[in-house]
């Protein structure tokens, strides 16, 4: 025997008080699947959260963060303060990256500069708080006379 509630589409609930007819979800609630016996309360984007997508009878609201903050967690469950490039967020707020570290984004932590010598390379451009170092060719590649390419001999003219 088929459950009469299975005929109730998304956006409704199966109303046991009214002979299991399909009743529309109340305002500020939704059902995203059919056959539900209740609707779900819409998420409210308040405070630092702002509404990215309004709640409808068939889908929940979606939030993002107000300027100066960014989303964290599944479905933007949290908003975290932005910092400037060259900074990281600590318990005491935004702090400049320590020497030898950088952050090129408004979020996340300061990361150590690349150690060029580990790859046998030299530092071509020094790092800053906002940018990683740029590694260049290895020191051996740069020493004079190290080139293995010999220029071609000049072509001789016939009869010489």
């Amino acid at each position: 025997l088929q459950d009469p509630c299975s005929n109730c589409p998304a956006g409704t609930f199966c109303d046991n008080n009214r002979n299991q007819i399909c009743s529309p979800c109340p305002p500020n609630s939704f059902s995203s699947a059919g056959g539900q016996r209740t609707c779900d309360i819409c998420r409210q984007c308040k405070g630092v959260f702002r509404t990215r997508k309004e709640c409808s009878s068939t889908s929940n609201a979606e939030c993002d963060c107000t300027p100066g903050f960014h989303c964290l967690g599944a479905g933007c469950s949290m908003c975290e303060q932005d910092c400037k490039q060259g900074q990281e967020l600590t318990k005491k707020g935004c702090k400049d990256c320590c020497f030898g570290t950088f952050n090129d984004q408004k979020r996340g932590i300061c990361r150590p500069w690349t150690n060029c010598s580990l790859d046998g390379k030299s530092v071509l451009v020094n790092g800053t708080k906002e940018r990683d170092v740029v590694c260049g060719p290895s020191p051996a590649d740069l020493s004079p006379g190290a080139s293995s390419v010999t220029p071609p001999a000049p072509a001789r003219e016939p009869g010489h």
């Epitope: 609930f13 008080n17 009743s23 109340p26 500020n28 016996r37 209740t38 609707c39």
Partner: nanobody, 122 residues
């Protein structure tokens, strides 16, 4: 026991006005989410308007915005729906509804009353 008693319906010409009342007992309208749903002939239920939360924020279906006004009289424990610029498509049985929030997080509503018939016709 929760009881809802609707009144104020009737026959009205297009462009006319009506004021529906819902006398509530068994709960306090000022402390609950309450509203109006309607059922047109041969159609399903449709939410018309609601007062949500004790702060009194209001909801209106797009089809009635600017024409219907929901209000409540806390002293009389009564909910009202002032309907103006009525159209033939507003013809329906209007029910007073109380939104019910369940412990598991679900939302439903009950319409305990018999409803009041509104007919818009010339």
């Amino acid at each position: 026991e929760v009881q809802l008693l609707e009144s104020g319906g009737g026959l009205v010409q297009p462009g006319g006005s009506l004021r529906l009342s819902c006398a509530a007992s068994g709960f306090t309208v000022s402390a609950e989410d309450v509203g109006w749903v309607r059922q047109a002939p041969g159609k399903g239920l449709e939410w018309v308007s609601a007062i949500l939360d004790s702060g009194g924020s209001t909801y209106y279906a797009e089809s009635v915005k600017g024409r219907f006004t929901i209000s409540r009289d806390n002293a009389k424990n009564t909910l009202y729906l002032q309907m103006s610029s009525l159209r033939a498509e507003d013809t329906a049985v209007y029910y007073c509804a109380r939104v019910v929030y369940h412990a598991g997080g679900g939302v439903t509503y009950d319409t305990r009353g018999q409803g009041t018939q509104v007919t818009v016709s010339s």
